[in-house]
Interface confidence: medium
């Protein structure tokens, strides 16, 4: 218990801490500029991303991951992600050439809090939003996805890239820049303005006026290529992928000594290369160029192919599976991949979260709860089952008139009416003689408790069903001595048999009362009786806690990924979607203990472990 004074002190401390503790601000920002998105060159290029006559617009998503670290599947965009604004609306013009599509304004910016890793993986998705009048608002679909791994120093110039995804082509530029006070190629060094009373670290000279201290001293080795080199310490020159040499000016796999052309160098004895097909490195995406007798050849890094390594082939190395998906590559490391998606996600990259509640799975007014890893229905009072499909008390609040008894079953109540009444609620008077119940010409008389038959000569019984034979023999069993045949009023049973019949009738009456309380079950195995222990949340986690009935043992499909199978058990009256199992709270005590049979993990509950004929007692 915290006193008011103590709580005031606590809140003051929190406020002070918030003021004086350093605020978490990004170390830097990765910026992505999309230049164009449209059909790529070559045959089979799509005319338009929009469906015929339906306007659409584009937007982009970028996902960044540290390139060299093995990222956990749960954090697919460990460096961050960003979504662009929606682009202008585009409508396909019939017959017009396929254009580059109108793009969203501005940059995609991904702030990063920690050090910029230098090597990173990116995934850029192009999404289409269709603006037709479809039910449920606009429809989104993924048009293209490109991915790659790059080296990039923070603070460097914009790097340009072209990527192809299927028949689409995406042109873009990107850079990483530090946010003050962070500086350096990894944005790990902090600087204060010159006015602040501090000095830079060892080996750093004071800054020029109006410049930030520590900013100026980081100068790479003189002549270090600004396009292909970078430095993290003053005076060094480190090369981006695909480049080598002391100043990062030599493409990998090309050496001046290998070229047969050009004059010899006096200092090295090597041939000084003249202009050749590999000059300027025509190989994109870090590919290395080597000359061939006729032209050049690119050796592409993993995940790229094409004459100039310009085509991106996304592989598992690019981490393309979102939302904890497991990436399974093809037999060849460079071949296509398949994302195995966890429950609740689908799509080729597990990028689509299924709004399973929109399918309205909960019946009878149940509330649908999508908990991510599980889909649950919270049932209204009186309903149970994974989708609230079982009516626990069909008769609640419904009365049967004129002494009728309510019988539940199948989600709707039914009245078993007293003799002389009929209709849904036993409100209609019924003529018990209308059905001509008296056999062999017997006359029927209606009566407050039912009917009476006056039998024609030669017949007897409640419905005149037994003939009385002229020779004195009866259709009934032989009467004990001293009794006249055809005298049912005085036809006595032996005491033991009489007791047995009485017990049977009493038992049947009890059973009928129970049936009327609990309801007829069409399938004895499709209903759980009370007395079944409620599953404990500690017993078996997830779907194994669901009590399964005979009907649910392997008939019906396994759940689709949209209906995710692995679920939690909630003992607070929430019913777990795990069709066709039933997990219900019970309301009545059974007459007989349930019989537990069947395979492990299943319970079959037999409603009446007695012959069913006992239920036909009139």
């Amino acid at each position: 218990m915290v006193s008011p004074r103590m709580s005031g002190l606590l809140s003051q401390t929190v406020i002070l801490a918030l003021i004086f503790l350093p605020q978490t601000r990004p170390a830097g920002v990765f910026e992505l500029q999309i230049h164009s998105f449209g059909p790529g060159p070559g045959p089979g290029a799509p005319r338009s991303p929009c469906s015929a006559r339906l306007p659409c617009r584009l937007f982009f998503r970028v996902c960044l991951k540290p390139g060299l670290s093995e990222e956990a599947a749960e954090s697919p965009c460990a460096l961050g992600a960003a979504l662009s604004a929606r682009g202008p609306v585009y409508t396909e013009q019939p017959g017009a050439p396929a254009p580059d599509l109108p793009l969203p304004d501005g940059l995609l910016q991904v702030p990063f809090r920690d050090a910029w890793p230098g090597t990173f993986s990116f995934i850029i998705e192009t999404w289409r939003e269709e603006l037709g009048d479809q039910i449920g608002g606009p429809a989104w679909s993924l048009l293209a996805r490109v991915a790659g791994r790059r080296r990039l120093a923070a603070g460097g110039p914009w790097a340009r890239d072209i990527q192809r995804a299927g028949a689409w082509e995406l042109r873009f530029s990107y850079r990483a820049r530090c946010e003050p006070p962070a500086v350096g190629t990894a944005c790990t060094r902090l600087c204060r303005p010159r006015s602040a009373p501090s000095r830079c670290g060892p080996g750093l000279r004071p800054c020029a006026p109006l410049e930030d201290e520590c900013e100026a001293p980081l100068v790479c080795r003189a002549g270090c290529s600004p396009e292909h080199g970078f430095c993290e310490q003053p005076g060094e020159c480190r090369c981006l992928e695909g480049w080598t040499g002391p100043l990062c000016t030599v493409p990998v796999s090309t050496s001046s000594c290998l070229s047969p052309r050009g004059p010899s160098s006096a200092t090295t004895g090597c041939l000084v290369p003249g202009p050749g097909p590999c000059d300027g490195n025509p190989c994109a995406n870090g590919g290395s160029c080597s000359e061939t007798p006729r032209s050049f050849e690119c050796t592409c890094p993993r995940g790229f192919y094409g004459l100039r390594c310009e085509v991106s082939g996304v592989t598992c190395a690019d981490g393309p599976c979102f939302n904890g998906g497991l990436c399974v590559g093809g037999a060849d490391p460079d071949s296509a991949y398949i994302c195995h998606c966890p429950p609740g996600f689908q799509g080729s990259n597990c990028e689509k979260r299924v709004d399973r509640c929109s399918l309205q799975p909960c019946r009878n007014g149940g509330l649908c709860l999508d908990l991510g890893h599980a889909l649950r229905c919270r049932c209204r009072a009186g309903f149970a089952g994974p989708r609230c499909e079982h009516d626990l008390d069909d008769c609640a609040g419904r009365a049967c008139a004129n002494g009728g008894t309510c019988v539940e079953g199948g989600g709707a109540h039914r009245c078993s009416c007293a003799l002389g009444f009929g209709g849904r609620d036993c409100r209609e008077r019924a003529d018990p003689c209308a059905a001509r119940p008296c056999a062999h010409g017997g006359r029927c008389y209606a009566h407050f408790s039912g009917l009476v038959c006056a039998c024609a000569p030669g017949y007897m019984g409640a419905r005149c069903e037994f003939p009385v034979h002229p020779d004195g023999a009866s259709a009934l069993p032989a009467a004990p001595p001293g009794l006249r045949p055809g005298d049912p009023q005085r036809y006595l049973l032996p005491p033991a048999l009489g007791l047995l019949v009485a017990a049977g009738v009493a038992g049947a009456a009890l059973l009928l009362v129970h049936v009327r309380r609990r309801g007829h079950s069409q399938d004895a195995g499709s209903r759980l009786l009370a007395g079944t222990p409620e599953p404990s949340v500690h017993a078996l986690p997830d779907a194994l806690n669901n009590l399964r009935t005979q009907e649910g043992s392997g008939d019906g499909p396994s759940s689709s990924v949209d209906w995710n199978r692995p679920e939690d058990v909630d003992p607070q009256g929430i019913y777990v979607i795990s069709a066709p199992s039933i997990y219900a709270r019970e309301v009545a005590t059974p007459l007989f203990p349930p019989l537990h049979t069947g395979r492990a993990g299943q319970r079959q509950h037999l409603l009446f472990p007695y012959p069913s004929s006992i239920l036909s007692v009139k």
Partner: nanobody, 119 residues
Framework: EVQLVESGGGLVQPGGSLTLSCVAS????????MGWYRRAPFKQGELPAG???????AYADSAKVRFTISRDNAKNSVYLQMNSLRAEDTAVYYC?????????????WGQGTLVTVSS
């Protein structure tokens, strides 16, 4: 539709081994991916292992060295051999089956088999 039945779960001591089996039946296709998903109480679920139609395997970091996934296409089955089991491997293991039709992946899940690692 596809039905999946897992077996092989049970109680095992830390450091012990267990092999889970899963059989797919129903309208299965040869172009499918299979694997295992596990959920422990109060933990986020994960996919420890998967195998593609051509037999390529993938493992989560937590399962890389200790678990081996294999499949028998003739029997429409997938297996998970788990060695050096630890307490944190205790979970319900669900077999899954994906097949792609017209670019859409359909996923199916079994009922699960409980693996308890405890001394």
């Amino acid at each position: 539709e596809v039905q999946l039945v897992e077996s092989g779960g049970g109680l095992v001591q830390p450091g012990g081994s267990l092999t889970l089996s899963c059989v797919a039946s129903g309208s299965t296709s040869s172009i499918n991916a299979m694997g295992w998903y596990r959920r422990a109480p109060f933990k986020q679920g994960e996919l420890p292992a998967g195998i593609s139609p051509d037999g390529t395997k993938a493992y989560a970091d937590s399962a890389k060295v200790r678990f081996t996934i294999s499949r028998d296409n003739a029997k429409n089955s997938v297996y998970l051999q788990m060695n050096s089991l630890r307490a944190e491997d205790t979970a319900v293991y669900y077999c899954y089956y994906f097949h792609t039709v017209c670019g859409t992946s359909m996923g199916y899940w079994g009922q699960g088999t409980l693996v308890t690692v405890s001394s």
